[in-house]
């Protein structure tokens, strides 16, 4: 007869959701052009937006030096406010939390106050986003 | 501390080739846009090229396009500028250049010098 | 292209104020960077988004833009101040420098 201990069983929990993207250039009303430099990603980038397959609260970190002064917002549903937008800025460098639900997609919007440029050049661009609730619901 | 480190300059032939390298150290390199400036003997300073830190960005002052080939290999912290068809009036200091924010060069090289002579 | 228009030389009195113009159509609009050379050296920014001071650069440089000119201002030019100075935009797709002003401490 075996027995088995609940400690000796660790739950199967997937791997936890986390992508890095970066992003070296932005058009000017439109988002940033974003890339995931690893192939090993759990999470996936799509017309680029970073799909929530998870509900759950997500550690976002945002950084990058910009070629103009700009206004940034990053979203993550149509018709619903950013989650965090800085207006007037040439360089980034911050942390939030926030509540994704299944289907959101994470996207930039930016702006420059200047008609001189379509595009907006990027040093040191990255969005970081790491799900803090493994084991919620997750549909894939 | 940052250093960038121009080599390749020579002295070549109207309608020969060169290849210019910069290594580069002290910050990183994969995320910045990184550049060549040139300055002719006695006269200002121009912008030559430019190229993302990803390398899939690149752009080219008219008066070289064409002719001249900008690209960078991440794993060895270098940049590249492959020069063919080169004229008389190529003849300058080239620097590579850098910096925190995209098109502020705060991080320059020593220059090396490329003279086009037959 | 986009042109930079700056004079070729300037003149100053050590220990008075240096106004170096650049002039451009609508370059307030852009941002703009300023560049000292001195003889056998690279270049060193000293002006970035038109009126910022990497660290380093003594408080005595500083910069404005609007309408159709730059202005880096010298409040009390220095012996060592004696250089080129360029300025600097990005226009479109291109950088574009401005012709350089020599400027030279009496």
């Known amino acids: 007869c075996l027995h088995f201990y609940a400690s000796q069983v660790p739950p199967q929990y997937p791997p936890i959701q986390s992508i890095r993207v970066q992003f070296t250039r932005c058009e000017n009303e439109k988002g940033c052009i974003i890339t995931s430099p690893s192939k090993d990603e759990t999470m996936k980038v799509q017309d680029n937006s970073i799909i929530i397959n998870c509900d759950g609260f997500y550690l976002i970190s945002l950084k990058g030096y910009f070629s103009e002064e700009l206004s940034l917002s990053l979203y993550y549903r149509k018709g619903r406010g950013p989650l965090f937008s800085l207006s007037k800025v040439t360089s980034v460098d911050s942390i939030g939390v926030a509540y994704l639900a299944f289907k959101d997609k994470v996207y930039f919007n930016v702006t420059t106050h200047s008609t001189s440029y379509k595009d907006i050049q990027v040093n040191g661009g990255e969005l970081i986003l790491i799900h803090q609730n493994p084991g919620g619901f997750c549909a894939y | 501390e940052v250093l960038l480190m121009e080599s390749g300059g020579d002295l070549v032939k109207p309608g020969g080739s060169l290849r210019l390298s910069c290594v580069a150290s002290?910050?990183?390199?994969?995320?910045?846009?990184m550049y060549w400036i040139r300055q002719a003997p006695g006269k200002g300073l121009q912008w030559v090229s430019q190229i993302s830190g990803d390398g899939s960005f690149t752009n080219y002052a008219d008066a070289v396009k064409g002719r001249f080939t900008i690209s960078r290999d991440n794993a060895k912290n270098t940049l590249y500028l492959q020069m063919n068809s080169l004229r008389d009036e190529d003849t300058a200091v080239f620097y590579c250049?850098?910096?925190?924010?995209?098109?502020?060069?705060?991080?320059w090289g020593q220059g090396t010098l490329v003279t086009v002579s037959s | 292209s986009y042109v930079l228009t700056q004079p070729p030389s300037k003149n100053v009195t050590l220990k008075q104020p240096a106004h170096i113009t650049c002039g451009g159509d609508n370059i307030g609009s852009k941002s703009v960077h300023w560049y000292q050379q001195k003889l056998g050296q690279a270049p060193v920014l000293i002006i970035y988004?038109?009126?910022s001071r990497p660290t380093g650069i003594p408080e005595r440089f500083s910069g404005a833009n609007s309408g159709n000119t730059a202005t880096l201002t010298i409040s009390g030019a220095l012996a060592e101040d004696e250089a080129d100075y360029y300025c600097q935009v990005r226009d479109s797709s291109a950088n574009v420098f401005g012709g350089g002003t020599h400027l030279t401490v009496l």
């Open positions: 988004y038109d009126s």
């Open positions: 250049a850098s910096g925190i924010y995209p098109n502020a060069f705060g991080y």
């Open positions: 002290g910050f990183t390199f994969s995320s910045n846009y």
